[in-house]
Amino acid sequence: EQAPGTAPCSRGSSASADLDKCMDCASCRARPHSDFCLGCAAAPPAPFRLLWP
């Protein structure tokens, strides 16, 4: 994963100043107090496409 200063983090990840790294938001379930989890909470969810018109 790239450093947050290099490029924006990819979808589903957020920048950790502490680690100088984009971190997977999925890890916030195990470590909810990590600094990057704030960015995960603020990020919009992945687009959801309805299965009917």
Partner: antibody, heavy 123, light 111 residues
Framework: QVSLKESGPGILQPSQTLSLTCSFS??????????VSWIRQPSGKGLEWLAH???????RYNPSLKSRLTISKDTSRNQVFLKITSVDTADTATYYC???????????????WGQGTSVTVSS | DIVLTQSPASLAVSLGQRATISCRAS??????????MHWYQQKPGQPPKLLIK???NLESGVPARFSGSGSGTDFILNIHPVEEEDAATYYC?????????FGGGTKLEIK
């Protein structure tokens, strides 16, 4: 029980390449969030962070030394390596490796350290 | 680089009294939610030992007489009451951005 141990050449001459090994146990460098840093301390002086390697092989270096540093790892053997090229007497120091790992509250600073290995650069 | 300046460089404190060590950063090491400052203790011939992480969180096994406070650029390590075994050099360290840097150290002597 987490432990780390550094090893190195002890003495080397100016312009040579310093190769250091950090052998650790009690944690895995394949665990998400885990990382190992190298830090050095000249005798009687302060601490200087050199480099860090992450579980996914991502690497970070101190910009003041970046051109001379290479950090790498062998996850299966629980080892982290640091090479410093073109050493000078100013590189004489005790070299430490230290772990940064995840916990419930986020990520530790350097919570476990090795005892250090003394390196002298002398002609 | 963020420069961490510790003061005093050394101090002598009587047994049972309070020791206060300051660490000032050249720029803020805090965000609205986090302060990325940590404290270590180092005794001669030993590696540093983590005491306090993220300004005020005591590392497991560290006595409650150690406490940390501060935000932004100004941080404090307090030891009260000081015990004989606290004689050591204390370092602050930040992880706000790279490179991670340490303060110059404060040597604590017990009178």
């Amino acid at each position: 029980q987490v432990s780390l141990k550094e090893s190195g050449p002890g003495i080397l001459q100016p312009s040579q390449t310093l190769s250091l090994t950090c052998s650790f146990s009690g944690f895995s460098l394949s665990t998400s969030g885990m990382g190992v840093s190298w830090i050095r301390q000249p005798s009687g002086k302060g601490l200087e962070w050199l480099a860090h390697i992450y579980w996914d092989d991502d690497k970070r270096y101190n910009p003041s030394l970046k051109s001379r540093l290479t950090i790498s790892k062998d996850t299966s053997r629980n080892q982290v390596f640091l090479k410093i090229t073109s050493v000078d007497t100013a590189d004489t120091a005790t070299y430490y490796c230290a772990r940064r790992g995840p916990d419930y509250y986020g990520y530790y600073p350097m919570d476990y350290w090795g005892q250090g290995t003394s390196v002298t650069v002398s002609s | 680089d963020i420069v961490l300046t510790q003061s005093p460089a050394s101090l002598a404190v009587s047994l049972g009294q309070r020791a206060t060590i300051s660490c000032r950063a050249s720029k803020s090491v805090s965000t609205s939610s986090y302060s990325y400052m940590h404290w270590y203790q180092q005794k001669p011939g030993q590696p540093p030992k983590l005491l306090i992480k993220y300004t005020s969180n005591l590392e497991s096994g560290v006595p409650a007489r150690f406490s940390g406070s501060g935000s932004g650029t100004d941080f404090i390590l307090n030891i009260h009451p000081v015990e004989e075994e606290d004689a050591a050099t204390y370092y602050c360290q930040h992880s706000r951005e790279l490179p991670w840097t340490f303060g110059g150290g404060t040597k604590l002597e017990i009178k």
